[in-house]
């Protein structure tokens, strides 16, 4: 009996530019002889429904149809037919199929590969055209993929034990696609500093599929309206 097992859940998520290993494990009732077996990896793009050969291994012959693709012969001996792809790109997301032949038996498994890019975040103070005691803080998130992103603003006052989500005076712009396929977006918070308590911490919170925990950039309102620290005066408040 020949069986192939892929990543549990049927989906693997990998960061952009990572050296990804797409898992494929072979289970066979007898010891594997790699000279009399074959491994072929196929890829089907998210946009085209056509399957393309990525890598093949037959006996003493192996060929990478995607530059850098490799299946380790040493690991193959112990049943590990995982495919390593260095420098994975966004457009390489899709369905990967691992096909194993141990004559006369054949087994296969498929996995969806998702490529994600984590956003970078920076906080900027824009005072151009603002009224007295009014400030506009901009939270820029850039270089993320996929497009879905959630940006919220929170404040933490001195007195209350938990943060508070701010919903008023927040405008989040449309996402903009970059040349490399990643996205950028900016969210703005308008603050009337005369109505806020000094010592209140404001935070831009970015949640995205690529992040285990939210990305946070913060600033603290001081008694003097514009007394931001030097690091805050540049770009990054985090």
């Amino acid at each position: 009996d020949l069986k192939v097992e892929m990543m549990a859940g049927g989906t693997q998520i990998t960061p952009l530019n990572d050296n990804v290993t797409i898992f494929c494990n072979i289970f066979y009732s007898q010891p594997l002889n790699i000279t009399s077996m074959g491994i072929t990896w196929f890829w089907k793009s998210l946009t085209f429904d056509k399957e393309v050969k990525v890598f093949e291994f037959f006996g003493d012959h192996q060929e990478a149809f995607r530059p850098g693709a490799i299946v380790s012969p040493w690991r193959l001996k112990s049943g590990d037919a995982s495919l390593r792809l260095p420098g994975i790109q966004l457009e390489e997301a899709g369905e990967y199929r691992c096909e194993v032949v141990v004559t006369p038996l054949k087994a296969q498994g498929t996995v969806q590969l998702e490529v994600v890019a984590s956003p970078a975040s920076r906080l900027l103070l824009d005072q151009v055209g603002m009224k007295e005691n009014e400030d506009k803080y901009m939270c820029e998130s850039s270089g993320f993929y996929p497009e879905a992103i959630n940006i919220t603003w929170e404040k933490q006052t001195q007195k209350f034990p938990h943060p508070i989500e701010i919903s008023e005076d927040v405008i989040t712009g449309p996402t903009i696609k970059n040349m490399d396929g990643t996205f950028n977006v900016t969210s703005c918070l308008k603050l009337n500093s005369s109505q806020e308590d000094p010592g209140t911490v404001y935070q831009c919170v970015v949640r995205h599929a690529s992040l285990h925990t939210p990305l946070r950039s913060n600033f603290t309102l001081t008694a003097a309206r514009h007394s931001l620290s030097e690091t805050e005066k540049t770009d990054n408040f985090s």
Partner: antibody, heavy 117, light 107 residues
């Protein structure tokens, strides 16, 4: 990292007073507000009051007004909660708690105060 | 004072179950609600703030929802360590008030 270390367990007679301390470390002490909570055995949580750690202001639960006093010693980064005219129903675990960051708020380990004749 | 009415007071469930705990505020508290988990002999640990935001490090199986007066804490797939007591808390105004708690027990 932030730590709130409270004083040890106390046994008091009815009518007496108790003073529980909470020593803070790992952050700029005076820029925070400290709350005090209590929990009677097998019961829920109850907010008693809070104090701004620069010592500027306090806010007490009406239920405890006149019996509770919260003070700060900034030189030792310690906050105190004193409860007077103790009765048996004041038997509880008393906690000091500080506003959190993004892993949640910080709590002391608790101080058990037993009021018994 | 704002009353927080939590239900049920106790709940029996099995590992892997999905459970929901509700909390009703006596007046509008917006989204100023937090949820705590408390294990026996330990200080409470905060799970959720602003009704629906998980604190960093809290497993994704915990989720909160609601606004105004009605709030829920949902545990999507119970793990053995989740069988303990949960409290809601409003923090829109002083005095801070808590629900009476929900004890989650193994069926």
């Amino acid at each position: 990292q932030v730590q709130l270390v409270q004083s040890g367990a106390e046994v008091k007679k009815p009518g007496a007073s108790v003073k529980v301390s909470c020593k803070a470390s790992g952050y700029t002490f005076t820029s925070y507000w400290m709350n005090w909570m209590r929990q009677a055995p097998g019961q829920g949580l109850e907010w008693m009051g809070g104090i701004y750690l620069s010592g500027e202001s306090t806010d007490y639960n009406e239920k405890f007004k006149g019996r509770v006093t919260m003070t700060v010693d900034t030189s030792t980064s310690t906050v105190y909660m004193e409860l007077s005219s103790l009765r048996s129903e004041d038997t509880a675990v008393y906690y000091c708690t500080r506003r959190g960051d993004y892993f949640g708020d910080f709590w002391g380990q608790g101080t058990l105060v037993t009021v018994s004749s | 004072d704002i009353q927080m009415t939590q239900s049920p007071s106790s709940l029996s469930a099995s590992v892997g179950d999905r459970v929901t705990i509700t909390c009703k505020a006596s007046q509008n508290v917006g989204k100023y609600v937090a949820w705590y988990q408390q294990k026996p002999g330990k200080a409470p640990k905060s799970l959720i703030y602003s009704a629906s935001n998980r604190y960093d490090g809290v497993p994704s199986r915990f989720s909160g929802s609601g606004s105004g007066t009605d709030f829920t804490l949902t545990i999507s797939s119970l793990q053995p360590e989740d069988f303990t007591t949960y409290y809601c808390q409003q923090y829109i105004s002083y005095p801070l008030t808590f629900g009476a708690g929900t004890k989650l027990e193994i069926k």
